[in-house]
């Protein structure tokens, strides 16, 4: 049960001693500066207090310094994501110091013991930073700690303990068990650096969540709602791994945070945007695609520093693989009436036609229920850049004249003879691009033909001036 994962080890337990560590010659925490572009090469181990070694290892005092901090390990070895992240950082920031914090002996333990070791590892990282700070040219503001899973909380402790304030901490799906709801000083928190940005990719809302659910940074980004990542479904995992197991699915979703961060380093021309929103369901309804007042931000390495008093939860959709960028659109659809709906919701699809490309048939996800005589908001996204939107096609899935439909219509006619068919009246669709923030209004070609029934489609073109709302500053200012 979850209570077996209550936070353990505390100030009563001489907690500063590492837990479950074999007495070997190997240091329990090593600082390995990666100088070679070959990820398989060992690198150079720094030693606290040894200034000569700093020089020999090629440590650049004035450059940016990245500390990569891994998490809990079952294998006791570095996983492949670490090498990818090292390479991506070296490619992007050529002069930077890339230091791998190797705490494998303390992380290759029972999870509870590894958790209890995060504090002491954080202290060692802080100790290294304090020593580096003694050198005149070294600035803590140039330090960026990047922690994955348990490593995110190690980074938090390091930021907490260091004398001064580190420039940035990035938490890559910080661990959830034994950190959810704990005191602000026992986990990664906004106080731990000048800027703390977090990616949450595996936060289950039921049972034991591998990643932490609650926001712990200045900005907390939840790609795809922070739970189910595309490409990590059971079928995807079976296809890409020799043994498609639950643990591979967990690894896929949890590790996705790292790959999103790597993507932000290597695919600079395809930056992903996240949008501030109070929760995932509002985002899915397309309500939150605003960039006003810092409400949107780049994700990963390119995130802009935002130091708000309150946490900022942000959401985005992604592709299943690199590059992860998608293009978000908000559709505001005014549905005038909806005849004979019964309880069934219509299955609607939209196809967007742009100056660069056309989209696929995109489902309009009905998160709650369609509101009648009201504006319904939807979120759709495309994997390619469509350019300027030119027209769109709305399709109501269903067969117009099947025997089943005829029987249904006959039944409907018996109960409501005046309204025999299921019909939806839509005059216009207002579209806003999340990435460009441009708004366009689309109208039916013929204002008299604005109804749609199952199995039918309705075409929309950019509205003529007469259809647009008259407004001096912006034709769409009242539509936001």
């Amino acid at each position: 049960s979850i209570t077996t994962l209550r936070p353990q080890g505390s100030l009563r337990d001489e907690h500063h001693k590492p837990t479950g560590v074999p007495a070997t010659a190997r240091p329990s925490v090593a600082f390995n500066i990666r100088t070679s572009k070959d990820p398989e090469q060992e690198g150079c181990n720094l030693s606290l207090g040894d200034s000569k070694l700093l020089e020999n290892c090629g440590f650049n005092m004035t450059a940016k310094t990245f500390f990569i901090i891994h998490g809990w390990t079952m294998s006791g070895m570095f996983e492949s994501w670490l090498h990818k992240l090292v390479s991506a950082l070296q490619m992007r920031e050529k002069d930077a110091n890339v230091v791998v914090v190797d705490w494998l002996p303390l992380a290759h333990q029972l999870y509870t013991d590894a958790v209890n070791n995060t504090r002491v590892v954080g202290q060692r990282v802080a100790g290294m930073l304090d020593w580096l700070q003694e050198k005149e040219e070294f600035s803590l503001g140039n330090v960026h700690l990047i922690g994955y899973s348990l490593g995110a909380h190690v980074a938090g402790y390091a930021g907490n303990f260091v004398k001064g304030t580190v420039g940035r901490i990035t938490g890559l799906d910080p661990a959830g068990p034994m950190f959810e709801g704990v005191d602000i000083n026992r986990r990664l928190s906004p106080d731990d650096a000048d800027f703390v940005d977090v990616l949450h990719t595996y936060t289950l809302s039921f049972g034991l969540s591998i990643g932490i659910r609650m926001p712990v940074g200045h900005i907390d980004i939840y790609p795809n709602g922070g739970d189910f990542q595309p490409g990590c479904g059971f079928n995807d995992v079976i296809g890409s791994f020799a043994y498609g197991t639950i643990s591979e699915m967990v690894k896929c979703e949890h590790e996705r945070a790292v790959h999103l961060f790597v993507d932000s380093l290597v695919n600079q021309d395809k930056p992903s945007f996240a949008f501030q929103c109070t929760d995932s369901s509002r985002f899915k309804r397309g309500i939150c695609l605003s960039c006003r007042k810092n409400r949107c931000n780049n994700i990963g390495y390119n995130a802009k520093k935002m130091r708000k008093k309150r946490n900022s939860k942000m959401y985005l959709k992604t592709r299943a693989g690199m590059p992860f960028k998608v293009y978000h659109y908000q559709l505001k659809v005014h549905m005038f009436s909806y005849n004979n709906s019964g309880d069934t919701q219509p299955t609607l699809y939209i196809t967007l036609y742009g100056s660069n490309a056309d989209s696929q048939n995109l489902p309009l996800e009905i998160v709650e229920k369609i509101e009648l005589n009201a504006t319904n908001t939807f979120l759709v996204y495309t994997e390619e850049d469509l350019g300027d939107l030119l027209k769109m096609r709305l399709t109501w899935e269903g067969v117009a004249h099947s025997w089943y439909n005829l029987w249904n219509e006959f039944r409907n006619y018996l109960s409501q003879p005046s309204n025999p068919s299921r019909e939806l009246y839509i005059r216009r669709i207002r579209v806003k691009s999340g990435e460009t923030q441009r708004k366009v209004t689309f109208c039916t070609q013929d204002p008299t033909k604005s109804s749609i029934s199952p199995g039918q489609e309705l075409w929309f073109h950019k509205c003529q001036d007469g259809w647009k709302m008259k407004n001096k500053t912006s034709p769409f200012v009242n539509l936001a």
Partner: antibody, heavy 116, light 107 residues
């Protein structure tokens, strides 16, 4: 076991300053935050702020910025809070507490009375 | 700042009864809530942290529950020595804030 021993009661004149001490034993003093909490008679608890002795980092409740100043001496395992420009509003019991899961352990409190 | 509200300033109960004290946060604090007991003339004591975890040595008649903005502290079988003021506190963000306290009186 963990213990926090606070200095004795103080009777102060308005406008004066007072420095309260909190001596910690039974744990690694430098690596846990020590908070200061105010309790006026018949009132609830008010968090003033906290200090991490090892790095001298502080966090203050903005209401007490300029009023309270935290320091710590790691050689004697003692945390201090100085209150300046005292008024009758500052008459209260002040507690130090060490934070881990929450405010795990508390000092016995120091009563400060401001009276002319 | 996050405001923690304990709606009952006083609660009266009898020995052996079950009593529940509620606390409401002005914004989501997830499960980052602690409960303290302050007996007359004593310092506060930590009973519950992270909304539902009992601190070391705390009797199991004391329980905590809740998440988000609504939290409950329960004493399952009140004893005479439970006469005290009970405070909730959020430890999600700085500044840490306490509820106003609920004084438990034994009939």
């Amino acid at each position: 076991q963990v213990q926090l021993q606070q200095s004795g009661a103080e009777l102060m004149k308005p406008g004066a300053s007072v420095k309260i001490s909190c001596k910690a034993t039974g744990y690694t003093f430098s690596t846990y935050w020590i908070a200061w909490v105010k309790q006026r008679p018949g009132h609830g608890l008010e968090w003033i702020g906290e200090i991490l002795p090892g790095s001298a980092k502080t966090k203050y409740n903005k209401k007490f910025k300029g009023k309270a100043t935290f320091t710590a001496d790691t050689s004697s395992n003692t945390a201090y809070m100085q209150l300046s420009s005292l008024t009758s509003e500052d008459s209260a019991v002040y507690y130090c507490a060490v934070y881990d899961y929450g405010a795990d352990y508390w000092g016995q409190g120091t009563s400060v009375t401001v009276s002319s | 700042d996050i405001v923690m509200t304990q709606s009952h300033k006083f609660m009266s109960t009898s020995v052996g009864d079950r009593v529940s004290i509620t606390c409401k946060a002005s914004q989501d604090v997830y499960t980052a809530v602690a409960w303290y007991q302050q007996k007359p003339g004593q310092s506060p004591k930590l009973l519950i942290y992270s909304a539902s975890y009992r601190f070391t040595g705390v009797p199991d008649r004391f329980t905590g529950s809740g998440a988000g903005t609504e939290f409950t502290f329960t004493i399952n079988s009140v004893q005479a020595e439970d006469l005290a003021v009970y405070y909730c506190q959020q430890h999600y963000s700085i500044p840490r804030t306490f509820g106003g306290g609920t004084k438990l009186e034994i009939k």
